[in-house]
Amino acid sequence: AITEAREEAKPYPLFPGPLPGSLQTDHTSLLSLPHTSGYQPALMFSPTQPGRPYTGNVAIPRVTSAGSKLLPPLAFKHTVGHIILSEHKDVKFNCSISVPNIYQDTTISWWKDGKELLGAHHAITQFYPDDEVTAIIASFSITSVQRSDNGSYICKMKINNEEIVSDPIYIEVQGLPHFTKQPESMNVTRNTAFNLTCQAVGPPEPVNIFWVQNSSRVNEQPEKSPSVLTVPGLTEMAVFSCEAHNDKGLTVSKGVQINIKAIPSPPTEVSIHNSTAHSILISWVPGFDGYSPFRNCSVQVKEVDPLSNGSVMIFNTSASPHMYQIKQLQALANYSIGVSCMNEIGWSAVSPWILASTTEGAPSVAPLNVTVFLNESRDNVDIRWMKPLTKRQAGELVGYRISHVWQSAGISKELLEEVGQNNSRAQISVQVHNATCTVRIAAVTKGGVGPFSDPVKIFIPAHGWVDHAPSSTPAPGNADPVLII
């Protein structure tokens, strides 16, 4: 998302001009040497300082086979030392050497920044033989140069186990500034200073930075790259970018949005998933987080009852998952429920309130005055009780559950009976003689089974020996049930 624009007018003299002994061109450069047919260079350059003696890496040849004369030291001819060109242009450069014909199998390799260039490079070596010497021209061409082509290029030639190295040819590819660091989107606290960084490189250097905030330039004079902008604080969202200028033009960074942290929006869509007598499972959809992560949420519960004192119960929970089981509620009650969530800035407003109800609860008290006696003529046990004083929240009585446990000679068996809500007595068949029968009764509503009454025991004798006295639950204050036989 980087846009590039070439500046036509360049008011700032950013580039000092060609260095001595350098070539600044957007054309191909060649030495003034023979070249392959069909390639006509745009410009030709003579070697710089052609008469200068070469003191670099040379090979001193042995005496000739005739043994009569020494050959001159072998060295690459001087060539242009520095080529400056724009990105996407083509370039061709070469090195040349004259090698006495006594040497065989001379090969020239190209190296860039100390590494040999192998493979798919456009390197051509041409030989121009003469009576005594062969002129060798090694050409290296790059089409559509990129910044990565910047570097120091040399030729190497191996001859008689000696290595001859050319002077370096420095290739400098210039182009529009290239960002190495761009401003990043951020969420910031209102009226609090923060920093943005912008860094761009050439060549050419220097690269100058201009900051832009909401389409207005922050600095009207250039700042050297890298540049850190201290924004003194924002009260509303702003968009920042930076412009990087060099002698070739300007590059504009991506625009980044800086958001102001705010309290979250209230949650929406509070829903009831499940209700029991004493709990309600709710979920909600979080509102917008205000550019700051949610920390936690608060579930607010008000009892909807003219007689209640209107107090609000508050349950704190984590922000995720967006679900909470509200516990410790009264049975068969109506509640108004709202949710609020917070981030580092503060609490959201409360969501729209929703109504929810708990279901009927189980009875909270057991049936009263339970009495048990044996009716031997019918071989059954009569049980009587009084209806418990249940609260409204327990719901409507639907019946009773009777537990009777028969114990005899180490054997124990529990049986359960259900009777309707209109009954306050029941008869159960004698299961075992010469045994103890323990009876407990619980009231039942749609909300569940209430607590069982205290146990009442009666002894069932063997056939023929019966006492009709009843057993009953103790009067209040008695420690244990009484067993009468």
Epitope: W211, S216, R217, V218, E220, Q221, E223, L229
Partner: antibody, heavy 118, light 106 residues
Framework: QIQLVQSGPELKQPGETVKISCKAS????????VNWVKQAPGKGLKWMGW????????TYAGDFKGRFAFSLESSASTAFLQINNLKNEDMATYFC???????????WGAGTSVTVSS | QIVLSQSPAILSASPGERVTMTCRAN?????MHWYQQKPGSSPKPWIY???NLASGVPARFSASGSGTSYSLTVSRVEAEDAATYYC?????????FGSGTKLEIK
């Protein structure tokens, strides 16, 4: 310490030219733009424009295009305001001010009073 | 261009009083700077970017605002605060000055 030192008061006749200087010290002159602000007697501040000390490019506010010229002598860290063909309404105190980011004028010259009288 | 209106034009207060002056823009701006000028002197930078006190400004001064409405407050006015205060917007070029509020001490 950072300061802007302005030239002394001027007494001119209508039609004449005046050139006011503003010499900066204590910072790199080419890093910050120099702005010019006019204050007529008993009046408020009026921004005249500025000169880019890096490129030398001047920018003039709407009312100050034509007879007004901003210039630089960077080697001397000095900015100049020249008013040609002086008129009576040019009688004022002229301030130079250094501008930092967000167009904040953090350093001001003491002002140069220009009196135009026939 | 953005026009800044300062009110009141003249503000008279007794020492120890709390005073507030406002600067309204006819279009939203990003920041407001404030300068203090005493008679015969050059303006002094006073508040930078809406709410940041310049070096040496007493802590009894504060400023705030956003959008089109900005204000400068002195919590307990002192005699040395007598001056004209100018606002200057940053948001749209040219970055204009307000007409000034003159604070007088009774």
């Amino acid at each position: 310490q950072i300061q802007l030192v302005q030239s002394g008061p001027e007494l001119k006749q209508p039609g004449e030219t005046v050139k006011i200087s503003c010499k900066a010290s204590g910072y790199t002159f080419t890093d910050y733009g120099v702005n010019w602000v006019k204050q007529a007697p008993g009046k408020g501040l009026k921004w005249m424009g500025w000169i880019n000390t890096y490129s030398g490019e001047p920018t003039y506010a709407g009312d100050f295009k034509g007879r007004f010229a901003f210039s630089l002598e960077s080697s001397a860290s000095t900015a100049f305001l020249q008013i040609n063909n002086l008129k009576n309404e040019d009688m004022a105190t002229y301030f130079c001010a250094r501008r930092v980011r967000y167009w904040y004028f953090d350093v001001w010259g003491a002002g140069t009073s220009v009196t135009v009288s026939s | 261009q953005i026009v800044l209106s300062q009110s009141p034009a003249i503000l008279s207060a007794s020492p120890g009083e709390r005073v507030t002056m406002t600067c309204r823009a006819n279009s939203s701006v990003s920041y407001m700077h404030w300068y203090q000028q005493k008679p015969g002197s050059s303006p002094k930078p006073w508040i930078y970017a809406t709410s940041n006190l310049a070096s040496g400004v007493p802590a009894r001064f504060s400023a705030s605002g956003s959008g089109t409405s900005y204000s400068l407050t002195v919590s307990r006015v002192e005699a040395e605060d007598a001056a004209t205060y100018y606002c200057q917007q940053w948001g749209s070029n040219p970055f204009t000055f307000g007409s000034g509020t003159k604070l007088e001490i009774k």
